[in-house]
Interface confidence: low
């Protein structure tokens, strides 16, 4: 018996073939023997069956000895051995139609889980191998699951399906909601504007939803709420925001924060939350903000940092183009007496300046510049 | 519990061919992935390809395309890695190891030692 | 291909200490990072697989973690039965790759 694979919604086309080239009474049948379709001559004559609306044949094709049975808009209940009875003969076809959709929606929160469903018709015993964007194969029966989706998980999954030795072939798209960035660093001297983005990973048409960014600053007790907004169509709307300091907020996306000054007090982390419309759970991005300040004081140059900075960073002073003079893996260091000239301050990962700060040391009578 | 047994040790000579067998026994590995890893005399692990036997899917690292074939028989239960042109810088020891859906290898073949000597 | 750093190439420490053993991927890895032990002679045994998952049978002084780049294996108490070398492995792309090994050896 000859086993064909379909998959639901789509056309299936079953073919019976006579000897004769040429048109010749046929007639196809279900396995409870109810006539589907039939010829009469050249007209096409069809049972009582199920399929009516669905099935067709080809009537061009009857001359050469070839009488199709094509089903439309296939269901898992199509499932079933169908009979085409042709020149004293008997051909059977046994139909297995199958369905592969994804949990509730294909859209889903990065670190959520994707559930593969199979939909197969009784007494069937198929196995399934999907093949993620990244190229990760997954292997199970009825269901496949994958938890902690990531951002690569992003993407047209290929899912194959077996049975009888035989394939068919899904194709599911997901889309997986998330920051482009877990995290982020913003290194910036004292002073200087700050710009914050937060671009998403994905494009839908309509985005509405609501999110905050709290703030820790490092030499503060407890963590405060910096702006909440809105998202409408992928306008946002400021709904609160805090007076220090003076946050402004792009009114397009990807979503923009400015803090006009970079100042010791503001060093710290964030977090930003997105909740979007009709979707459990939220999006987080991580932000750092880490600020360097050099002064000169009596005798004293002096190099600070603030905000989260990793103990494998290195923060160094030293007179230009000369040799560091002091380089540490601390978050301030200094020089007693410096010598005039224009001094640099550099912090640096593997010998990678992430920020630079430079102040110029006048001979003892005058006063510091600063740049 | 699941078993690998690998074939047993080769003695080739350069630009031979060396075809290497994994049977699995005691669990259902046919819906596993089957990799293959080598590893040279006192280096370390170096992945070659894979085969899910069920599928008859197969993946190779580049550097081996073209000179390494993975191939499954699903009636027995066994994996196959040939690899042609031979030369000494593949003598080493050829694992086969079963691939989870974490990308790990839960369980390893004992290894067979492939000696590549005119 | 993802390049996989480990951490010290080799250390030599005595039973009862508290070991660490650092992997660092080139690019990040999310948490599928796998870590293995192999003795001479052997084939490798899984001891956590996705950065933090300990194996079934393998006792709980081994603990792993790390997400992105950076991975730590531990061995909070090390027995005579834990000299051997570690590996780790990356899962997140094709092709998996190896770190180059630590070899854990005795005072």
């Known amino acids: 018996k000859k086993v064909v694979l379909g998959k639901k919604g789509d056309t299936v086309e079953l073919t019976c073939t006579a000897s004769q080239k040429k048109s010749i009474q046929f007639h196809w049948k279900n396995s409870n023997q109810i006539k589907i379709l039939g010829n009469q001559g050249s007209f096409l004559t069809k049972g009582p069956s199920k399929l009516n609306d669905r099935a067709d044949s080809r009537r061009s094709l009857w001359d050469q000895g070839n009488f199709p049975l094509i089903i439309k808009n296939l269901k898992i209940e199509d499932s079933d051995t169908y009979i085409c009875e042709v020149e004293d003969q008997k051909e059977e076809v046994q139909l297995l139609v199958f369905g592969l959709t994804a949990n509730s929606d294909t859209h889903l929160l990065q670190g959520q889980s994707l559930t593969l469903t199979l939909e197969s018709p009784p007494g069937s015993s198929p196995s399934v191998q999907c093949r993620s964007p990244r190229g990760k194969n997954i292997q199970g029966g009825k269901t496949l699951s994958v938890s902690q989706l990531e951002l690569q998980d992003s993407g047209t999954w290929t899912c194959t399906v077996l049975q009888n030795q035989k394939k068919v072939e899904f194709k599911i798209d997901i889309v997986v909601l998330a920051f482009q960035k877990a995290s982020s660093i913003v290194y910036k001297k004292e002073g200087e504007q700050v710009e914050f983005s937060f671009p998403l990973a994905f494009t839908v048409e309509k985005l509405t939803g609501s999110g905050e960014l709290w703030w820790q600053a490092e030499r503060a007790s407890s963590s405060k709420s910096w702006i909440t907004f809105d998202l409408k169509n992928k306008e946002v709307s400021v709904k609160r925001v805090t007076q220090d300091p003076k946050l402004q907020m792009g009114k397009k996306l990807p979503l923009h924060l400015t803090l006009p000054q970079a100042l010791p007090q503001y060093a710290g982390s964030g977090n930003l939350t997105l909740a979007l419309e009709a979707k459990t759970g939220k999006l987080h991005q991580e932000v750092n903000l880490v600020v360097m300040r050099a002064t000169q004081l009596q005798k004293n140059l002096t190099c600070e940092v603030w905000g989260p900075t990793s103990p494998k960073l290195m923060l160094s002073l030293k007179l230009e183009n000369k040799e560091a003079k002091v380089s540490k893996r601390e978050k301030a260091v200094w020089v007693l007496n410096p010598e005039a000239g224009m001094w640099q301050c550099l912090l640096s990962d593997s010998g990678q300046v992430l920020l630079e700060s430079n102040i110029k040391v006048l001979p003892t009578w005058s006063t510091p510049v600063q740049p | 519990q699941v078993q690998l047994v690998q074939s047993g040790a080769e003695v080739k000579k350069p630009g031979s061919s060396v075809k290497v067998s994994c049977k699995a026994s005691?669990?259902?590995?046919?819906?596993?992935?089957i990799d293959w890893v080598r590893q040279a005399p006192g280096q370390g692990l170096e992945w070659m390809g894979g085969?899910?036997?069920?599928?008859?899917?197969?993946t190779y690292a580049q550097k081996f395309q073209g000179r390494v074939t993975i191939t499954a028989d699903e009636s027995t239960s066994t994996a196959y890695m040939e690899l042609s042109s031979l030369r000494s810088e593949d003598t080493a020891v050829y694992y086969c190891?079963?691939?989870?859906?974490?990308?790990?290898?839960?369980?390893w073949g004992q290894g067979t030692l492939v000696t590549v000597s005119s | 291909d993802i390049q996989m750093t480990q951490s010290p190439s080799s250390l030599s420490a005595s039973v009862g200490d508290r070991v660490t053993i650092t992997c660092r991927a080139s690019?990040?890895?999310?948490?599928?990072l796998n870590w293995y032990q192999q003795k001479p002679g052997k084939a490798p045994k899984l001891l956590i697989y996705?950065?933090?998952s300990l194996q079934s049978g393998v006792p709980s002084r081994f603990s792993g973690s790390g997400s992105g780049t950076d991975f730590t294996l531990t061995i909070s108490s090390l027995q005579p039965e834990d000299f051997a070398t570690y590996y780790c492995?990356?899962?997140?792309?094709?092709?998996?790759?190896f770190g180059g090994g630590t070899k854990v050896e005795i005072k």
């Open positions: 190891a079963r691939v989870t859906l974490y990308g790990d290898y839960d369980y």
């Open positions: 005691g669990g259902t590995s046919n819906n596993y992935a």
């Open positions: 085969i899910i036997p069920l599928f008859g899917t197969t």
């Open positions: 690019q990040s890895i999310n948490r599928y």
């Open positions: 996705a950065a933090s």
């Open positions: 492995q990356q899962a997140n792309s094709f092709p998996p790759t």
